[in-house]
Interface confidence: low
């Protein structure tokens, strides 16, 4: 029952507690148990015992084995078990099953990945993380003290995250890693009409001749995952990829934000050099889903240079 | 991911016919206009024919016209190259290529195409 | 038919030169070109769209430029995974959506 299961890798820092607690005043004595050989305290050693902690700095893979670690209080002594286990450093990326630390579930509201084990550790900032062996980058991923945040969560962001950081012990230096996996979960979503939130009904947008102008269909469908929801324009009401302009052309790829927790959908149309025969078209910004369709119509107007008289 | 993957090529006589297929993953493919682009053993890329996203409308290379025939099957996320009358010349690798911003963003492997008696 | 004309069509340069292609289609009127970088036995790659932009992923050593009839693509400190055929790319901005595609240039090692 008091046992507890440890793992590290080779040439890495690995910090064990003991699986039974006791008050910081009472003595705690560390054992091999193969051996019933006690565990030095003195840090010079590579691997010495610190009141509940273990220590291994670094670790061997001939370090693995179970060690016998007795409380000791005035009245009474508990004994616990740490089962540890040291690997060889994966030449590969895949991090196999044994070495990896609990999953943790996370969704659009709530996406920290805390870092196993790290409170064991002394350890200073930066901490570093990785999903599925590459650096993370980008505005998305926040390290946050001992957790990763992930703004956005998408479920392409499930996978196995590893964090890596260094333990100090008197001046010296010790990497660590650590990994686990993360799943997203859905939200409970739902469904409505489309709501069109860019261009207005009837918008018109000035725009100069000669020059290239933008048009943005957004559009929201509910909250969650849309199994059916799409934006796109319609010009005189013929599909962008039919009507045989090359000039104008839709964003392909749709971009799906979440505006207060809505799922919404962009759509541009990039119109190159406009011409005079472009003010004359009907601009349909369509958004559908299983509700329904709504469409928002826009014109272009010429947009007047200002005359500068003498 | 976006992925192109060609089949049905392989070695025909002159005259002949061959039907290229390329099943796309990854996009939603009803909405891209595709494109065959062929290149010769050793030499450059040629232009061969391309079709709106919905299938409407229809263009060839001057080389092609009236031999090949472009279609797509938006259903099952597909474009089609139907080859008829196939000479010599029309030997090479054939390519199908999404069109994206006024250029081709994504390309399947090749299918080889060999015309000989 | 109208061609782009690609030059030159072939080139040797060494790792950390400064490489520039260029690409022509006076015929054409306005257009836009794209470029794309081809190695043995594999299908080309997207390196440039509608004349300067570059697609994500591709390194900020390649760019575009030009308008009208003539196009660039610079290649500004050769890499040792950047010997390879180069293609320029057109398609007019008016009128039927053809593809035009240059000659190629093939970059090889000095």
């Known amino acids: 029952k008091f046992s507890k299961q440890s793992w590290g890798l080779e040439n890495e820092a690995l910090i064990v507690r003991c699986p039974r607690q006791g008050k910081p005043s009472y003595t705690v004595d560390w054992y091999y148990s193969q051996t019933n050989k006690s565990i030095p305290t003195q840090e010079r050693n590579r691997v010495f015992a610190s009141g509940q902690l273990l220590k291994f700095l670094p670790a061997a893979v001939a370090d693995s084995g179970i060690y016998t670690c007795i409380v000791r209080s005035p009245t009474f002594n508990r004994t616990g078990y740490a089962n540890v286990t040291i690997y060889k450093k994966q030449s590969d990326c895949n991090v196999p099953d044994y070495l990896m630390y609990s999953t943790v579930s996370g969704s659009e509201k709530n996406s920290k990945i805390y870092c196993p084990t790290i409170d064991l550790y002394n350890w200073t900032a930066p901490l570093e993380w990785f999903k599925n062996c590459q650096a993370l980058q980008g505005s998305r991923y926040r390290a946050h003290k001992s957790f990763l945040v992930i703004d956005n969560v998408m479920t392409e962001d499930a996978g196995d995250y590893t964090c890596k950081f260094i333990h100090n012990e008197n001046g010296a230096n010790y990497s660590v890693t650590a990994t686990r996996s993360f799943t997203v979960k859905d939200e409970q979503g739902f469904s409505l009409f489309p709501v069109i939130g860019a261009p207005a009904q009837n918008e018109i947008k000035e725009v100069e001749i000669g020059k290239n102008a933008n048009l943005t269909c957004s559009a929201c469908f509910g909250k969650g995952t849309q199994f059916l929801a799409a934006v796109l324009w319609q010009l005189n009401g013929t599909k962008i990829t039919d009507f045989g302009e090359p000039r104008i052309q839709q964003e392909e790829g749709q971009n799906q934000s979440f505006s207060n927790g809505l799922a919404c959908l962009d759509m541009v149309l990039r119109i190159a050099d406009v011409k005079e025969e472009d003010l004359l078209l009907q601009y349909d910004c369509l958004a559908l889903n299983l509700h329904g369709l709504r469409r928002h119509t826009v014109r272009l107007s010429r947009k007047n240079p200002i005359d500068h008289h003498s | 991911e976006v992925q192109l993957l060609e089949s049905g090529g392989g070695l025909v006589q002159p005259g002949g016919s061959l039907r290229l297929s390329c099943a796309a993953s990854g996009f939603t493919f009803s909405r891209y206009a595709m494109n065959w682009v062929r290149q010769a053993p050793g030499k450059g890329l040629e232009w061969v024919s391309a079709i709106s996203g919905s299938g409407g409308n229809t263009y060839y290379a001057d080389s092609v016209k009236g031999r090949f025939t472009i279609s797509r099957d938006n259903s099952k996320n597909t474009l089609y190259l139907q080859m008829n009358s196939l000479r010599a010349e029309d030997t090479a690798v054939y390519y199908c290529?999404?069109?994206?911003?006024?250029?081709?963003?994504?390309w399947g492997q090749g299918t080889l195409v060999t015309v000989s008696s | 038919d109208i061609q782009m004309t690609q030059s030159p069509s072939s080139l040797s340069a060494s790792v950390g030169d400064r490489v520039t292609i260029t690409c022509s289609g006076d015929r054409l009127g306005e257009k836009y070109v794209s470029w794309y970088q081809q190695k043995p036995g594999k299908a080309p790659k997207l390196l440039i769209y509608e004349n300067n932009n570059r697609p994500s992923g591709v390194p900020s050593r390649f760019s575009g430029s030009g308008s009208g009839t003539d196009f660039t693509l610079t290649i500004s400190s050769l890499q040792p995974e950047d010997f390879a055929t180069y293609y320029c790319?057109?398609?007019?901005?008016?009128?039927?959506?053809?593809?035009?595609f240059g000659q190629g240039t093939k970059v090889e090692i000095k």
């Open positions: 790319v057109a398609r007019a901005v008016r009128g039927n959506p053809h593809v035009l």
């Open positions: 290529a999404r069109v994206w911003r006024n250029s081709l963003d994504y």
